[in-house]
Amino acid sequence: ECGHISVSAPIVHLGDPITASCIIKQNCSHLDLEPQILWRLGAELQPGGRQQRLSDGSQQSTITLPHLNHTRAFLSCALNWGNSLQILDQVELRAGYPPAVPRNLSCLMNLTTSSLICQWEPGPETHLPTSFTLKSFKSRGNCQTQGDSIMDCVPEDGQSHCSIPRRHLLLYQNMGIWVQAENALGTSMSPQLCLEPMDVVKLEPPMLRTMDPSPEAAPPQAGCLQLSWEPWQPALHINQKCELRHKPQSGEASWALVGPLPLEALRYELCGLLPATAYTLQIRCIRWPLPGHWSNWSPSLELRTTERAPT
């Protein structure tokens, strides 16, 4: 190889200067005695190279780019060779930003997958390869003192969430959890969460059903619906409160909310509705009075209220 480029730093803050030098060895005998070294950034020739002959007879050109405004570009040094440009060497330059502090870290305990799922907002684009790692440890107290550290959780490329499997969790013991972001320009860490996995549990919703009319029970009044719900069995022993929402199927009406309902109400008469009207209903629940996350809304149940009896 006749030429070699070295740079002050191959990765810099976007807009920062960068200095590069290109040396052509003397033993490239097919060259002119004083070849002129040219610089090119991407497709553009760059003026301002300062060239000198070194004591060993090789030629060196040094250039300072005052502002690297490309997030990714190739810098090459070249010679005029006949009517064409002969590239001697090139390097890839990258520019971007250090990672911002990851924001809005939150976690939920999924009892179906037996894992603690944490998600966060990575912040603005850095234009550089940036790795995110979910870090955690067990703590007997309020996370001021660190207990056993838990294996790092590394999300899949481009994802801003990660799952800590059950084998690393103690359901009723505090964990310190934070996200570390790292790239060539720096490292940042989110504020630390301190939580018990069960305090961020997200349950599956109950299954809404229409209540089978029993022979001895009075039929529902006009504008009323008789409902029942089947709790999600794996969460049967968790104290919960629930809420119901309903809206007429036709028209643009918004959801009306009814609650709180105890999970174990199991049977419920919903009144004050329009007679002879088809309604869509859903239910959701949350661990209560202990902390937790609301479940998703249940699949919809569609029911029709009875008509008003003729007067």
Epitope: S114, R166, L171, E264
Partner: antibody, heavy 118, light 107 residues
Framework: EVQLLESGGGLVQPGGSLRLSCAAS????????MGWVRQAPGKGLEWVSS????????PYADSVKGRFTISRDNSKNTLYLQMNSLRAEDTAVYYC???????????WGQGTLVTVSS | DIQMTQSPSALSASVGDRVTITCRAS??????LNWYQQKPGKAPKLLIY???NLQNGIPSRFSGSGSGTDFTLTISSLQPEDFATYHC?????????FGGGTNVEIR
């Protein structure tokens, strides 16, 4: 310290009735599911019934459904099991236990022996 | 109903041995598996809940693993006080069901 103390066991004839009680102390009784588990002599454990914190949900094992009734009095911190139409196969030590949020039993009472025999 | 099958039903072991007891569910129960120790004439005592969570006050030589249908209780180094009967229990759905028990006796 959480304590559960069963009482009411004894010898009863087939077809007879018995009411077991479990007095709870050391925790907020009204916040927890409670349950009964039995163990026939030399056999394994068998879940009998559970009751939700306010008493609204009461699942039963098929083997006792329609004969046994679980109930609770949160003002007295006491769990009950009313056993009617008793059979020889109901002979067992009956334990009352607190139910954890994901369905485990802890702690347990010391047990009370129910013997159904003529 | 979910059936729980425990194996072996009995085993002989010596102090210091590593002991493994398995429990199989007739259908998937996620991690809803609990382990108990029972000594003669005494009430059962909870060792492990939710497949791998060690109950407070239980020595760390006890550990649980598995998910779905296959679960294991391991005693890393058997101590004299560990000779007892061990029961598994599923809490995924009612009726709550127990395995038949494993009696760990002195060889």
């Amino acid at each position: 310290e959480v304590q559960l103390l069963e009482s009411g066991g004894g010898l009863v004839q087939p077809g007879g009735s018995l009411r077991l009680s479990c007095a709870a102390s050391g925790f907020t009784f009204s916040l927890y599911w409670m349950g009964w588990v039995r163990q026939a002599p030399g056999k394994g454990l068998e879940w009998v019934s559970s009751i939700s914190s306010s008493g609204g949900v009461t699942p039963y094992a098929d083997s006792v459904k329609g004969r046994f009734t679980i109930s609770r009095d949160n003002s007295k911190n006491t769990l009950y099991l009313q056993m009617n139409s008793l059979r020889a196969e109901d002979t067992a030590v009956y334990y009352c236990a607190m139910l954890g949020e994901l369905g485990w039993f802890d702690p347990w009472g010391q047990g009370t022996l129910v013997t159904v025999s003529s | 109903d979910i059936q729980m099958t425990q194996s072996p039903s009995a085993l002989s072991a010596s102090v210091g041995d590593r002991v493994t007891i398995t429990c199989r569910a007739s259908q998937g129960i996620s991690s809803y598996l609990n382990w108990y120790q029972q000594k003669p004439g005494k009430a059962p005592k909870l060792l492990i809940y939710y497949a791998s969570n060690l109950q407070n006050g239980i020595p760390s030589r006890f550990s649980g693993s598995g998910s779905g249908t296959d679960f294991t209780l391991t005693i890393s180094s058997l101590q004299p006080e560990d000779f007892a009967t061990y029961h598994c229990q599923q809490s995924y759905s009612t009726p709550l069901t127990f395995g038949g028990g494993t009696n760990v006796e002195i060889r």
